[in-house]
């Protein structure tokens, strides 16, 4: 077969080929940020000629053109400046309202390099309607000027702009407009991952319902959905495998889907995952009717087995058939469970479509969506039972109109996105399911995204201050209790001056809480073994503080999971009959267990907890500490089995002021506290300039550094005695 000519350079940009110069290969242009390629792509035809998708005239030279943002077409009850036909990247537009109107949204907006405006639609509103003035997004024209209950407004976009969101919205009884805000965008525009991840994540979190099945009442961010213990989510992942998707991109589709599966299983809900790859025909790799669809490892392995070559005989994009196979799956499940049963009616369904182009065969995908809505009986009351996310990847041939038509329309949410490339998709899936925004007390959730603050990464972490100075750290283990070290409290029982500083999204300094009650282990006595020549002894170094008020859960304040509780059992996705011993075997399951603690400056530092034989050699070093233990004969007199040991090799050592803080591990995107920082042989902060300076111990130091942490598995009786009505403990 003839190959296509190679004179296809783009001035100022680059290009990639999906299958070299052979027929069927897709040539994709890209330009530096702030510019877009025209045309975006070309396809090598069997005749050996390049064809530009959608082009009517002959092949023109490819160029990088400057990105521009759409201008306002009309702005009600106010003025905007400057008035231009379109705006360059970095250009601003400012809005002001006439007297009697209040500006809602962003008074100044800037054109971003992706052709999208930053901020929110500016609206001048006088608050007269049943619903607020829905505004007119930049580049849009609205018809309908009444905002009473039942009134409708319609939108269209000027010139060649594409509408995403709802073209028609209705003012509902609750004073909220139906659907989602329409946005007019350039056909070449795309979404930045940092915008998509939170938008997608918020919507998804709503759908998941912030479910913590051990809670009596459940509230999520916005939509108050309750997926009870009996509730169930069916997640359908549809991966485009058509010709225009390169093998490498398909791998990233798979990897992104794996991230999604991994993350979704870390929620405490019952979930079944279907995997469907599609080109000209769909291929079901995992059906929700298969019991394995509830098992994360099975789902991931079926994803891993998805083969790019499965579709090499039919390379079109038949989105209709892919969605129709979801419909058929639903139909079969409905027949199995019975149409009228709660078991069927209470299942929530989420479809994630990953595609790189418009469907070009098999009929309109919208028809399949209509069938799906029909079988699930989606109406205003049951709107929460279906979410369709349409994600286009690679700006080239993605059809905004089609994606928008497929994506769900829900107030304050977005379900249709276009990303620049598969790398951006991977980024989104890495960060989208940020459970840390949930408002209930789901435990052990930290925000793992790259741009999260230290406190968002470890939201259980608190600082304890006796007077003005910080002295110890601790961990929230519920919305009112903090776990810390007993040795922090050496001034008798007057805690009236003490404060606990808890993370707060509204202040970088956190929020201070008074202590209602301090429960210090009666077994703790630092001088208990003084007459044996052990000048300091830290057995039973554990304390609980009850805060004077409950902490409001947020991105910055949330409890860590305590092992041996039902809350931790759910987070570990363990079966119901699990015991405390099972948790210990799962969490402390190696000779050297990687763990973390939080430094004075809030960063997360790494240690390795030594178990078994390695614990013995880790602890042995204490015999070399002659000041604190002048005539020690048996190390176990000092290092009892209440302690975990770390500090060997490359471990960081905690400073004195880090005492009481959690020693924790990560499993399945959740965090579990296995110990608390107690004492050590080396202080890396001693005499340092500030919280950011730590000194490594010299290699020649005698004794070498060692750190000892109270092992929570050994403190169960005491924890149960004081927290029995706060947490749900498992049998020992």
């Amino acid at each position: 077969a003839p190959s296509c000519p190679q004179n296809v350079n783009i001035s100022g940009g680059t290009f990639t080929l999906s299958h070299g110069w052979a027929p069927g290969s897709l040539l994709t242009y890209s330009c530096p940020q702030g510019l877009y390629p025209s045309p975006a792509s070309r396809l090598c035809k069997s005749s050996g000629q390049w064809q530009t998708p959608g082009a009517t005239r002959s092949l023109s030279k490819a160029v990088c053109k400057p990105v521009r943002c759409p201008a306002p077409v009309s702005f009600e009850n106010g003025i905007y400046t400057p008035r231009l036909g379109s705006y360059p990247v970095g250009g601003n537009v400012s809005f002001e309202c006439e007297d009697g109107f209040i500006l809602r949204g962003s008074p100044v907006r800037q054109c971003r390099p992706n052709g999208m405006w930053d901020g929110e639609t500016a609206v001048c509103d006088n608050g007269a309607g049943h619903c607020p003035n829905p505004g007119i997004s930049l580049g849009a024209v609205r018809t309908g000027f009444r905002f009473g209950h039942g009134d409708k407004v319609r939108y269209r976009c000027s010139s060649n702009l594409v509408l995403t969101g709802s073209s028609e919205r209705e003012c509902q009884g609750n004073g909220v407009w139906s659907g989602t805000e329409p946005i007019c965008r350039q056909p070449y525009s795309y979404d930045f991952p940092e915008d998509v991840a939170p938008a997608l994540g918020t919507s998804f979190s709503h759908m998941l319902g912030a479910t913590n099945p051990t809670q009596k009442t459940k509230e999520s961010l916005g939509r108050k959905i309750q997926i009870q213990r009996s509730g169930h989510l069916n997640l359908y992942l549809l991966l485009d495998c058509s010709q225009s998707v390169s093998e490498n991109d398909f791998l990233i589709f798979k990897e992104s889907a794996s991230l999604m599966v991994d993350r979704i299983f870390s929620f405490e809900i019952n979930v079944s995952v279907a995997i469907i790859t599609f080109a000209s025909e769909p291929k079901v790799l995992m059906s929700v009717l298969n019991d394995n669809s509830r098992d994360m490892t099975e789902v991931i392995s079926s994803l891993e087995n998805a083969n790019y070559k499965d579709h090499e005989n039919g390379t079109g994009t038949n989105t209709y058939a892919a969605l129709n196979s979801v419909y058929l799956m639903m139909n079969n499940q409905m027949r199995l469970l019975g149409m009228e049963t709660m078991a069927w009616q209470e299942i929530r369904h989420a479809i994630i479509l990953l595609t790189d182009g418009k469907s070009n065969m098999g009929g309109s995908p919208k028809t399949a969506v209509d069938h799906i809505r029909e079988i699930l009986n989606i109406n205003q009351k049951r709107n929460d039972y279906l979410d369709i996310y349409a994600i286009g990847v690679g700006k080239l041939d993605v059809d905004w109109r089609e994606l928008n038509e497929l994506g769900s329309k829900k107030d304050g949410e977005r379900h249709a996105f276009i990303l620049q490339d598969t790398k951006a998709l991977h980024q989104v899936f890495e960060h989208m399911l940020d459970v840390s925004k949930l408002t209930d007390t789901i435990c052990g959730v930290g925000n793992m995204s790259a741009n999260a603050s230290d406190q968002e990464r470890t939201p259980w972490h608190v600082t304890i201050k006796p007077k003005s100075q910080e002295t110890c750290r601790g961990a929230l283990i519920s919305d009112q209790w903090v776990l810390t070290a007993a040795h922090c409290f050496r001034d008798g029982n007057d805690h009236s001056l003490w404060r606990v500083n808890v993370g707060d999204p509204k202040s970088q300094w956190g929020k201070e809480f008074l202590i209602e009650k301090a429960v210090i282990s009666p077994g703790f006595d630092v001088f208990a073994k003084k007459n044996q020549g052990i000048l300091e002894f830290y057995g039973d170094d554990i304390a609980l503080l009850k805060l004077a008020q409950k902490v409001k859960m947020s991105t910055h304040a949330r409890p860590i999971c305590l092992p041996c509780t039902m809350e931790a059992n759910l987070a570990l996705r363990r079966p119901q009959g699990s015991t405390c011993r099972d948790h210990e075997n799962e969490l402390l399951n190696k000779q050297s267990v990687p763990a973390h603690f939080v430094a004075l400056n809030g960063s997360k530092l790494n240690i390795n907890l030594k178990m078994g034989v390695e614990w013995t050699s880790c602890a042995e070093v204490v015999s070399q500490e002659k000041t604190m233990f002048p005539n020690l004969t048996d190390v176990r007199e000092v290092v009892t089995d209440q302690f975990l040991c770390s500090g060997t090799q490359e471990d960081e050592s905690p400073c004195k002021g880090e005492s009481g803080g959690a020693v924790f591990l990560e499993r399945r995107f959740r965090f579990f506290q296995v110990g608390l920082v107690s004492w050590g042989l080396y202080n890396p902060c001693l005499g340092s300039a500030d919280k950011n300076s730590r000194k490594r111990a010299p290699r020649s130091k005698v004794p070498p550094p060692r750190d000892f942490h109270i092992n929570l598995f050994r403190m169960q009786p005491w924890l149960r005695q004081h927290l029995g009505d706060v947490l749900n403990f498992l049998p020992l």
Partner: nanobody, 122 residues
């Protein structure tokens, strides 16, 4: 907060000894880690030694290890620094400090004495 007053400084020949004292007011002395810092002219303040609130553990800067000994008497609310084999480079103003956590971070310390001058010279 603990109020601290140092004493015992003076002029001493190289190889000689001095004993510094730091008297603390406030009944909470026994619950604080105590430490000594020093500052030579034109230099940063540097850590010299510290002792835990129990008196059970001590830490020293490498430059004074084996020559200086820190101790405390909780019944007298007093901290001591015994300095032997003094060298010219030990010349500095010596400050006593109290710290509840035991890290003695310079940015966080709010209990300092006014200092006592030690000069080692022949």
């Amino acid at each position: 907060q603990v109020q601290l007053v140092e004493s015992g400084g003076g002029l001493v020949q190289p190889g000689g000894s001095l004993r510094l004292s730091c008297s603390a007011s406030g009944h909470t002395f026994r619950s604080y880690y105590m430490g000594w810092f020093r500052q030579a002219p034109g230099k940063e303040r540097e850590f010299v030694a510290s002792i835990s609130w129990t008196g059970g553990s001590t830490e020293y800067a490498d430059s004074v290890k084996g020559r200086f000994t820190i101790s405390r008497d909780n019944s007298k609310n007093t901290l001591y620094l015994q300095m032997n084999s003094l060298r010219a480079e030990d010349t500095a103003v010596y400050y006593c400090a109290a710290d509840y956590s035991g890290d003695f971070l310079l940015s966080d310390l709010d209990s300092w004495g006014q200092g006592t001058q030690v000069t080692v010279s022949s």
